[in-house]
């Protein structure tokens, strides 16, 4: 499965002849922390999952999506407080009886080792060391993310 950056690259190549792409905008907005090709923002207040989801939208961002175990570990390394929990963009879909990311994809069972039940009204939080299933109404902090946007450079052929 192609990453969003790879898909973007293919689209650009198809729509614009003689175009190259280089990684760009490697600076996150002020107050955001860069983690690889993402910018992360940690809240300083608490909210249920739905409110957290909505609040990230006000920052033109989304609740954190975690691609794999490696990204989880790198994110957890940014968490300084041992006992604090943060909502991420993953909740239990009752209709599909599976964990579903807010981008519509389902959790690969090998990606995260979730402590707790997979049931209705459950949402996923992370701490410095673990991943938990919590009632979505629980009031905790959250993490927003922005994807760093590739810069597109038009390369003109020699005349």
């Amino acid at each position: 499965q192609k990453s969003s950056i790879e898909k973007c690259s293919v689209d650009i190549q198809q729509s614009r002849n003689k175009t190259t792409e280089r990684p760009g905008l490697l600076n996150c907005p002020i107050y955001w922390q860069q983690l690889r090709e993402k910018c992360l923002l940690f809240s300083h207040t608490v909210n249920p999952w739905n409110n957290s989801l909505a609040d990230c939208s006000t920052k033109e961002s989304s609740l954190l999506l975690i691609r794999d175990k490696d990204e989880l570990i790198h994110t957890q390394n940014l968490i300084r407080d041992k006992a604090i929990l943060f909502w991420i963009g993953l909740n239990f879909s009752l209709s599909e009886k599976n964990w579903k990311w807010i981008n519509g994809s389902f959790l690969n069972s090998n990606d995260l080792e979730i402590r707790g039940d997979a049931k209705e009204n459950s949402c996923i939080s992370i701490s410095q060391t673990s991943v938990y299933s919590e009632y979505c109404s629980t009031e905790i902090r959250w993490i927003c993310q922005k994807e760093l946007t590739p810069v597109r450079n038009k390369v003109y052929p020699d005349s």
């Epitope: 002020i30 107050y31 923002l41 940690f42 809240s43 300083h44 207040t45 608490v46 909210n47 249920p48 409110n51 609040d55 920052k59 300084r80 407080d81 604090i84 009031e139 905790i140 902090r141 927003c144």
Partner: antibody, heavy 120, light 107 residues
Framework: QVQLVQSGAEVKKPGASVKVSCKAS????????MNWVRQAPGQGLEWMGL????????YYNQKFKDRVTMTRDTSISTAYMELSRLRSDDTAVYYC?????????????WGQGTTVTVSS | DIQLTQSPSFLSASVGDRVTITCKAS??????VVWYQQKPGKAPKLLID???IRHSGVPSRFSGSGSGTEFTLTISSLQPEDFATYYC?????????FGGGTKLEIK
């Protein structure tokens, strides 16, 4: 303009409880998290905890976790901080302070302070 | 807990002087440092956030700098209304902590 108006001074005996109020005006009360900070006589500032008026969610400094309760009444745009089992070293000025941003920990507006004296 | 140590604790200066107050953190706090001014019997007033960003309405003679573990608040030319106590605060962790304060007095 933004204003946070706190309740008046209190004198309490050791072991008693005190409840301080903070009435907000000039902004959307549910749009900003409220914090409580105290200052003992001649001392520095100590953060006690926060309440999100929108949801009612709280988070307390572990030091006060067993003794503090923060609540709010959105109908009158008022936040409350109750501290129980008072001791003499709880004598301090208690401030409510508005969190300026959901994603940063600074306080942009403060109440005038409520003096709480704990004495037998 | 992250400790913040302010120096000096007391500072005597005259109107027109340039003064610098230092705040040292026991661990790296990035840029998550705030400065407040407090006058006797009053609540603290926000001056600077994120180590160097002046709050709206704060005069330009106040400036902040630093990152990591060492931060400074500078007042370029002291005015009579600037004599007060100044506090730094960190929010790199969710247990917000404050420095012990620097009392700025008239010489």
């Amino acid at each position: 303009q933004v204003q946070l108006v706190q309740s008046g001074a209190e004198v309490k005996k050791p072991g008693a409880s005190v409840k301080v109020s903070c009435k907000a005006s000039g902004y959307s009360f549910t749009g900003y998290t409220m914090n409580w900070v105290r200052q003992a006589p001649g001392q520095g500032l100590e953060w006690m905890g926060l309440i999100n008026p929108s949801s009612g969610g709280t988070y307390y400094n572990q030091k006060f976790k067993d003794r503090v309760t923060m609540t709010r009444d959105t109908s009158i745009s008022t936040a409350y901080m109750e501290l129980s089992r008072l001791r003499s070293d709880d004598t301090a000025v208690y401030y409510c302070a508005r969190l300026g941003d959901n994603y940063r920990g600074y306080f942009d507006y403060w109440g005038q302070g409520t003096t709480v004296t704990v004495s037998s | 807990d992250i400790q913040l140590t302010q120096s000096p604790s007391f500072l005597s200066a005259s109107v027109g002087d340039r003064v610098t107050i230092t705040c040292k953190a026991s661990q790296d706090v990035g840029s998550a440092v705030v400065w407040y001014q407090q006058k006797p019997g009053k609540a603290p007033k926000l001056l600077i956030d994120w180590a160097s960003i002046r709050h709206s309405g704060v005069p330009s003679r106040f400036s902040g700098s630093g990152s990591g573990t060492e931060f400074t608040l500078t007042i370029s030319s002291l005015q009579p209304e600037d004599f007060a106590t100044y506090y730094c605060q960190q929010y790199s962790t969710y247990l917000y902590t404050f420095g012990g304060g620097t009392k700025l007095e008239i010489k």
